[in-house]
Amino acid sequence: MKVLQEPTCVSDYMSISTCEWKMNGPTNCSTELRLLYQLVFLLSEAHTCIPENNGGAGCVCHLLMDDVVSADNYTLDLWAGQQLLWKGSFKPSEHVKPRAPGNLTVHTNVSDTLLLTWSNPYPPDNYLYNHLTYAVNIWSENDPADFRIYNVTYLEPSLRIAASTLKSGISYRARVRAWAQCYNTTWSEWSPSTKWHNSYREPFEQH
């Protein structure tokens, strides 16, 4: 049994880091493998993560962690029974993938303006809370070419757009994702999408 693709890990900068790797053949990850992880500080002890399958030869492990600080460094040991398959380390603050925003809502009752709001996925005492910016993706269910991205570079989790910038009388979907420039994070996963019917009054033509 060998590791084909070494574990790579990302942290949500809150309580979970996710590590993924590939073995050289089909593996029952949860019965055959264990990932041990240990914070490199005095009196810290190793914790065990039981991996799950992620495709035939792929494994994924969700490591429980404390609130992350930039000084945190973990040793990682991947074991198959008594055999050490791989040894490495992981600094959560250098591999951050934010949590996905939630509760995306489209408010359509604001005088021909669409107001999209969502929730910041972090509590106020988390460092990322005040450092997230967002991308909102809006697309038409009827027309695959009608696909747009709005970059929200301010902190407030909301976006206002004129309803008239979208076609009237058809259904649209929206989703949102987040990233934090300060930690050069990757983008989060997209939030679940929300659907609405876009309709607005065309302005009277003046002759």
Partner: antibody, heavy 117, light 112 residues
Framework: EVQLVESGGGLVQPGGSLRLSCAAS????????MTWVRQAPGKGLEWVSA????????YYADSFKGRFTISRDNSKNTLYLQLNSLRAEDTAVYYC??????????WGQGTLVTVSS | DIVMTQSPLSLPVTPGEPASISCKSS???????????LDWYLQKPGQSPQLLIY???FTAKGVPDRFSGSGSGTDFTLKISRVEAEDVGIYYC?????????FGGGTKVEIK
């Protein structure tokens, strides 16, 4: 919210014994090393002993080895300190604390041990 | 054992003015990743100690930003940018390099 509540202190005669307890809540107890620190009246802080999260590893200041024993019951989320052969100079407030990143991130309110005849 | 030495023993302060406390260790507290294994604690009158600063310069959650830690190796400083009445108490440094953990003797901060 992390809470640590010590109990078991009181008046004991020289040469006597006591068992201090520290009930923990608000965090996953098994994941953290725990420590006892004491403070004699009007004096500074003195580290006594620590125990790893699993309970398998224990650590003591030299002056307490052989007389004090640290232990934990992870099923009860409780830390203990057994004090034997007590002396007048062991009179102190005994604090339990939760370790993180080497340091003591949360402290209990303390329990007073008085050794006197 | 690592010996921690704090100064001054007592520090009378004026509210609104800055204050600083020194802590020296008998051996270097700097580790390979560039972090210093030193914490600062405050024990307010009649209360348990509370963590202020960890790893030399990281402010603990809920601690006002007027508190800051600096220094490296064997020489460290805790600074209060503008002292408030609620900051009175005894301040301790502690190393986290190895067991036994050892504390400095404490610095008593009181209002003038």
């Amino acid at each position: 919210e992390v809470q640590l509540v010590e109990s078991g202190g009181g008046l004991v005669q020289p040469g006597g014994s006591l068992r201090l307890s520290c009930a923990a809540s608000g965090f996953t107890f098994t994941r953290y090393a725990m420590t006892w620190v004491r403070q004699a009246p009007g004096k500074g802080l003195e580290w006594v002993s620590a125990i790893g999260g699993s309970g398998g590893r224990t650590y003591y200041a030299d002056s307490f080895k052989g007389r004090f024993t640290i232990s934990r019951d992870n099923s009860k989320n409780t830390l203990y300190l057994q004090l034997n052969s007590l002396r007048a100079e062991d009179t102190a407030v005994y604090y339990c604390a939760r370790h993180l990143r080497g340091g003591l991130w949360n402290w209990g309110q303390g329990t007073l041990v008085t050794v006197s005849s | 054992d690592i010996v921690m030495t704090q100064s001054p023993l007592s520090l009378p302060v004026t509210p609104g003015e800055p204050a600083s406390i020194s802590c020296k260790s008998s051996q270097s507290l700097l580790e390979g990743q560039g972090y210093n294994r030193l914490d600062w604690y405050l024990q307010k009158p009649g209360q348990s100690p509370q963590l202020l600063i960890y790893l030399g310069s990281f402010t603990a959650k809920g601690v006002p930003d007027r508190f800051s830690g600096s220094g490296s190796g064997t020489d460290f400083t805790l600074k209060i940018s503008r002292v408030e009445a609620e900051d009175v108490g005894i301040y301790y440094c502690m190393h986290t390099v190895q067991t036994p953990l050892t504390f400095g003797g404490g610095t008593k901060v009181e209002i003038k």
